[in-house]
Interface confidence: low
């Protein structure tokens, strides 16, 4: 027989021979990081027709760390369904649960024994601690100290000591997160109080107020002969600012000018009219309306000042 | 023979990337963790962390995480170290070096790579 | 980490002689503990593993021994070829840490 067959989990005893004589034994012993469990056969003998009789080395098995039981609220999942040195063992909490300690442990080889890379982590229930307080305004549950997984809480703002509203600016509700925090940012409470939008040959067509707080909408048109520069709906932002910025009207002009031809009255020049929700998250124009000479309008400035309590 | 042999010097610029390799033979690649230490110039060593080939699995000194990053391909037996967003810091000569199990309990660092210089200079 | 401080950093000894070097590790680090000799240019060698056991091909001239925070790696009887820098390591526990080395040059 030629040289005896090589296996990934052991080895040949002593040096190989080029070749054997028929009848010939070799043995073999588990290579280290391996284990032998009997009773399955380490060693082959050349056979009479110049073969090595079967032999494998499923009698050697690879070191394998110590079972780990599903943490309490969670699992132990071994990656690649095996315990052996080399591989990860993965926990994972159930909903409502978060991981105190390693995510991941490791099968390593302390020598040739196969011990965990640390201590298995534990399943903690998501606990949340009161959100924050805010500004001119309050949410439920102020009393409890600790809340719990998907609890949740509302925001709003206190009635307001002058002559304008607070607004509530943000998401009202917020809820206690899988890692042990908010869902969100609190809203604020403040006053919200944009300038009377004042568009010279043109007018308002709805909206109508003496007062515009946070949110309001105004929509012009133009006059006959003048054709709008600009959007025709604009609403009242969080900075008391429009947005977009207050139309113009503009003049229309002869048609051998290379200016636009006469528009209807009602047509605007942007291609589209943003909605309060899109031009929130958009760049805010640079623009800003000129003041208005509207008796008794104070400047947001001048507005209510946000104190705590 | 059991060998791990090492690329060869390398010289790059600050803020550059490196990799450096390490091909094992004599030996089933897949079986052993490969070790990587760092020694400056004058200095004393430092473990970097190791990757078992195996699996894919790897181990960092806390120091060298986000620095190295350890891979290996199996088909050609060879680890690999990458070093990011260098610095003089980074220097040095690495060394890559085979974990051997001596038996229950018992291992060592049994064959050393012969070293990869590794200077950061503009 | 634990912190390996070996001592002396560097020292003298003449041929016959016979040398002792120290590690104290910060920690008890249960005899994972290696030593190795490392040659101008050359890469490290391991001579000693788990505090006491020499390496296949090492010379017996080689020892080490100790336990919990203290070891140590003795010559019995210094050798031209010897002089070297020496380091321990520690590998019970992550990072796995060297101690600072120590020159061993012939008198």
């Known amino acids: 027989c030629e040289e005896p067959p090589t296996f990934e989990a052991m080895e040949l005893i002593g040096k190989p021979k080029p070749y054997y004589e028929i009848g010939e034994r070799v043995d073999y012993k588990c290579k280290k990081g391996y284990f032998y469990i009997p009773p399955l056969a380490t060693h082959t003998i050349c056979d009479r027709n110049h073969t090595w009789l079967p032999v494998s080395d499923d009698a050697c098995y690879r070191e394998t760390c110590p079972y780990i039981r599903d943490p309490l609220n969670g699992q132990a999942v071994p990656a690649n369904g095996t315990y052996e040195f080399g591989y990860q063992m993965h926990f994972i909490c159930n909903e409502g649960y978060y991981l105190i300690g390693e995510e991941i442990l490791y099968c390593e080889l302390k020598g040739s024994v196969a011990i965990w890379s640390g201590k298995p982590p534990i399943c903690e229930k998501v606990l949340c601690t009161p959100p924050p307080k805010i500004k001119n305004g309050k949410h439920t549950f102020s009393e409890v100290e600790v809340f719990e997984y998907l609890d949740a809480v509302t925001y709003s703002c206190d009635p307001a000591p002058g002559p304008d509203p607070f607004s509530l600016i943000g998401e009202s509700t917020i809820y206690c997160g899988d890692n042990s925090v908010w869902s969100r940012a609190a809203p604020e409470c403040k006053v919200v109080k944009c300038r009377f939008p004042v568009v010279e040959n043109g007018k308002q067509i709805s909206g109508f107020g003496k007062k515009f707080y946070y949110k309001a909408t105004v929509m012009f048109e133009c006059d006959k002969g003048f054709y709008l520069d600009g959007s025709d709906t604009i609403v009242c932002d969080s900075n008391s600012t429009w947005d977009p910025p207050v139309p113009k009207c503009l003049k229309v002009l002869p048609p051998s000018s290379t200016k636009p031809p006469a528009l209807s009255h009602s047509v605007s020049t942007s291609s589209t009219t943003k909605s309060p929700a899109s031009s929130a998250s958009g760049p805010r124009p640079t623009y800003k309306p000129p003041v208005s000479n509207y008796p008794g309008y104070p400047k947001p400035e001048e507005g209510i000042l946000d104190s705590l309590d | 023979q059991i060998q791990l042999q090492q690329s060869g010097p390398e010289l790059v610029k600050p803020g550059a990337s490196v990799k450096i390799s390490c091909k094992a033979s004599?030996?089933?690649?897949?079986?052993?963790?490969i070790n990587w230490v760092k020694q400056r110039p004058g200095q004393g060593l430092e473990w970097i962390g190791w990757?078992?080939?195996?699996?894919?699995?790897?181990r960092y000194n806390e120091k060298f995480k986000g620095k190295a990053t350890l891979t290996v391909d199996t088909s050609s037996s060879t680890a690999y170290m990458q070093l990011s967003s260098l610095t003089s810091e980074d220097s040095a000569v690495y060394f890559c070096?085979?974990?051997?199990?001596?038996?229950?309990?018992?291992?060592?660092?049994?064959?050393w790579g012969a070293r990869t210089t590794v200077t950061v200079s503009s | 980490g634990i912190k390996m401080t070996q001592s002396p950093s560097s020292m003298y000894a003449s041929l016959g002689e016979r040398v002792t070097i120290t590690c104290k590790a910060s920690?008890?680090?249960?005899?994972?503990l290696s030593w190795f000799q490392q040659k101008p240019g050359k890469s490290p060698k391991t001579l000693i593993y788990?505090?006491?056991r020499l390496v296949d091909g090492v010379p017996s001239r080689f020892s080490g021994s100790g336990s919990g925070q203290d070891y140590s790696l003795t010559i019995s009887s210094l050798e031209y070829e010897d002089m070297g820098i020496y380091y321990c390591?520690?590998?019970?526990?992550?990072?796995?840490?060297f101690g600072g080395g120590t020159k061993l040059e012939i008198k």
């Open positions: 920690q008890d680090v249960n005899s994972y």
């Open positions: 788990r505090a006491n």
């Open positions: 390591l520690q590998y019970d526990e992550f990072p796995y840490t």
């Open positions: 990757i078992y080939p195996g699996s894919g699995n790897t």
């Open positions: 070096t085979r974990y051997y199990y001596a038996g229950r309990y018992d291992w060592y660092f049994d064959v």
């Open positions: 004599g030996y089933t690649f897949t079986d052993y963790y």
